[in-house]
Amino acid sequence: CKAMHVAQPAVVLASSRGIASFVCEYASPGKATEVRVTVLRQADSQVTEVCAATYMMGNELTFLDDSICTGTSSGNQVNLTIQGLRAMDTGLYICKVELMYPPPYYLGIGNGTQIYVIDPEPCPDSDF
């Protein structure tokens, strides 16, 4: 296992619709053809996996159908979008990148992106 540098923004504010996008960029030491990207959430010292996708270079990222993540790739950059976020989902979202094939295997973990989420103000009741 060899180390690899991964960069991501330090802090992002999600939209009022609970959507946060950020770029995860990795310094690929070689010509990887198969890459795995995992988003981890760290909150109160606990780390949980949010979503993961494996993709072939030049192809789209494919997350599971029920995943809250979507993404696109371009060269050594992965543009990740996490949706359905609520205030309670505020936390540090860490990008983990693995170069799966061809060998050697490389692993890189970013410092994380602190995502802040605000629950939208409830709409005032309207009389009809």
Partner: antibody
């Protein structure tokens, strides 16, 4: 070195608007947030809101909602805070501060402050 | 909104004495998101402690922070003349971010 440099002091009449700038240097501007904090004479620190320089999304303190607008110009690494319908109790020193987000979760770099005086 | 309270409002001590400042949050705050700032007259605040207990770059070892949950403490082990100032705690665990009202440390 990493620093935030703010625009100069302003004197405004009640009902007017003020726009304070905060120019960042020495770091990747879009990777961090910019918070605005004000301090009335002899008072404590009041958080006004913040902007995510990465995507331009904003969050404002409830008491200022509708009167304040925070923006960024990523081409010049500058953040702006505009406050409208000024009142005498808006007289304060206005600070911008960098929100780190990851390792320190704090306002690690502060501007020098901009004195805004509202007086008729 | 998380309300931060600080005590005492004023602390009158002599140089060389130990200062203990308290900060309480109205609801639990992850210690990673609790910071302390020092402010001297006519100056911008300066980050002292982040993550409840980690000293910021260039901050002397006489400053230390501790605590978790709702109760946090800033300790200055031996007050130096330049330490007489106002100290604020602040949380950025939840929006809106909030500051405590401050504790003024003045010379006895």
């Amino acid at each position: 070195q990493v620093q935030l440099v703010q625009s100069g002091a302003e004197v405004k009449k009640p009902g007017a608007s003020v726009k304070v700038s905060c120019k960042a240097s020495g770091y990747t501007f879009t990777s961090y947030g910019i918070s605005w904090v004000r301090q009335a004479p002899g008072q404590g620190l009041e958080w006004m809101g913040w902007i995510s320089a990465y995507n331009g999304n904003t969050n404002y303190a409830q008491k200022l909602q509708g009167r304040v607008t925070m923006t960024t110009d990523t081409s010049t690494s500058t953040a702006y805070m505009e406050l409208r319908s000024l009142r005498s109790d808006d007289t304060a020193v206005y600070y911008c501060a960098r929100l780190t987000g990851t390792t320190s979760h704090a306002f690690d770099i502060w501007g020098q402050g901009t004195m805004v005086t509202v007086s008729s | 909104e998380i309300v931060m309270t600080q005590s005492p409002a004023t602390l009158s001590l002599s140089p060389g004495e130990r200062a203990t400042l308290s900060c309480r949050a109205s609801q639990s705050v992850s210690s990673s998101y609790l910071s302390w700032y020092q402010q001297k007259p006519g100056q911008a605040p300066r980050l002292l402690i982040y993550g409840a207990s980690t000293r910021a770059t260039g901050i002397p070892a006489r400053f230390s922070g501790s605590g978790s949950g709702t109760d946090f403490t800033l300790t200055i082990s031996s007050l130096q003349p330049e330490d007489f100032a106002v100290y604020y705690c602040q949380q950025d665990y939840n929006l809106p971010f909030t500051f405590g009202p401050g504790t003024k440390v003045d010379i006895k």
